[in-house]
């Protein structure tokens, strides 16, 4: 069977939504009303990996686009990017590790930890309109907590 994928949107703990910023970057900003339609809809795939009650391995693609969030080293630093893939081969149950995030939910907090780089998380800045990035600190200035809204296909 193919991998099961469900559509969702994400907001950080300050209620900032994620939108496209150019072809290969996401940014976080507050949206209201009709502007909410700008927010990115992810296709979240439940992929192979170590799983527990609080931790589920997922891949985050952009709905109806052959783009996936991936984690790679750039200048020796773990970096978040949007990577283009062959739509004939993706998504799949056994995703390469750079595409895999551990979706961790504890006490109303949802985090996305890179499987490739443990303790590095999808992060947003406190400031408006800044890029979504991979951050190596939790509980600091940067935001690593999200809420997720599933949406019908």
């Amino acid at each position: 069977a193919p991998v099961r994928s469900l559509n969702c949107t994400l907001r950080d703990s300050q209620q900032k939504s994620l939108v496209m910023s150019g072809p290969y970057e996401l940014k976080a900003l507050h949206l209201q009303g009709q502007d909410m339609e700008q927010q990115v809809v992810f296709s979240m795939s439940f992929v192979q990996g170590e799983e527990s009650n609080d931790k589920i391995p997922v891949a985050l693609g952009l709905k109806e686009k052959n783009l996936y969030l991936s984690c790679v080293l750039k200048d020796d630093k773990p970096t978040l990017q949007l990577e283009s893939v062959d739509p004939k081969n993706y998504p799949k149950k056994k995703m390469e590790k750079r595409f895999v995030f551990n979706k961790i939910e504890i006490n109303n907090k949802l985090e996305f930890e890179s499987a490739q780089f443990p303790n590095w998380y999808i992060s947003t800045s406190q400031a408006e309109n800044m890029p979504v990035f991979l951050g190596g600190t939790k509980g600091g200035q940067d935001i690593t907590d999200f809420t997720m809204q599933f949406v019908s296909s």
Epitope: M148, S152, S153
Partner: antibody, heavy 119, light 107 residues
């Protein structure tokens, strides 16, 4: 014994609000995704709301989106459904059920609480 | 969304009979299918998930099979306590939807 008990149903006028509660016992509530499923009189089943075990994930079908809000209090082992702008078609028995988006099925159900929306 | 169509909508059978209910999805649901039993005035009860896995405590006379878009629920030897309405439900894509139900009566 694993148990879910709903309360808060009743008769309400169109456009008004109602808040349902579901009390759980016999299992570790905070470890389970939860849902509300309704059944109109003499009809089938419709999943109307979902919340993840910690409360960070939610889902509503288009029929109730923007009108219903699901929430939970893990410290009190209780699930809630806030129903606003009620319509006649929201009439039915509302069941609290264990399960949701990830697992996909509902393995424990409450006895249901009836909601009637009528002027 | 994916629509689920059950057939028949009602059926009568005798104690000891083999009973079969079918559920057809409007698209491939890859075995992400569940069956429930709802006895009159009661809440639904999970019987089968993942198309063929029996839920805990469910008698072995109940079984499920199928793949793709077509699924079958079978009671190998009907018992009086099986009088109920049976529902299928898929969980492949959101929204997860239920079939309209099959009402089973004893003749």
């Amino acid at each position: 014994e694993v148990q879910l008990v709903e309360s808060g149903g009743g008769v309400v006028q169109p456009g008004r609000s109602l808040r349902l509660s579901c009390s759980s016992s016999g299992f570790i509530f905070s470890r389970y995704d939860m849902s509300w499923v309704r059944q109109a009189p003499g009809k089938g089943l419709e999943w109307v709301a979902y919340i993840s075990h910690g409360g960070a994930g939610t889902y509503y079908p288009d029929t109730v989106k923007g009108r219903f809000t699901i929430s939970r209090d893990n410290s009190k082992n209780t699930l809630f459904l806030q129903m606003d702008s009620l319509r006649a078609e929201d009439t039915g028995v509302y069941y609290c059920a264990r399960g949701g988006v990830y697992k996909g099925y509902f393995d424990v159900w409450g006895q249901g609480t009836p909601v009637t929306v009528s002027s | 969304g994916i629509q689920m169509t059950q057939s028949p909508s009602s059926l009568s059978a005798s104690v000891g009979d083999r009973v079969t209910i079918t559920c057809r999805a409007s698209g491939n649901i890859y075995n992400y299918l569940t069956w429930y039993q709802q006895t009159p005035g009661k809440a639904p009860k999970l019987l089968i998930y993942n198309a063929k896995t029996l839920a805990e405590g469910v008698p072995s006379r109940f079984s499920g099979s199928g793949s793709g878009t077509d699924y079958t629920f079978t009671i190998s030897s009907l018992q009086p306590e099986d009088i109920a309405t049976y529902y299928c439900q898929h969980f492949w894509k959101l929204p997860y939807t239920f079939g309209q139900g099959t009402k089973l009566q004893i003749t």
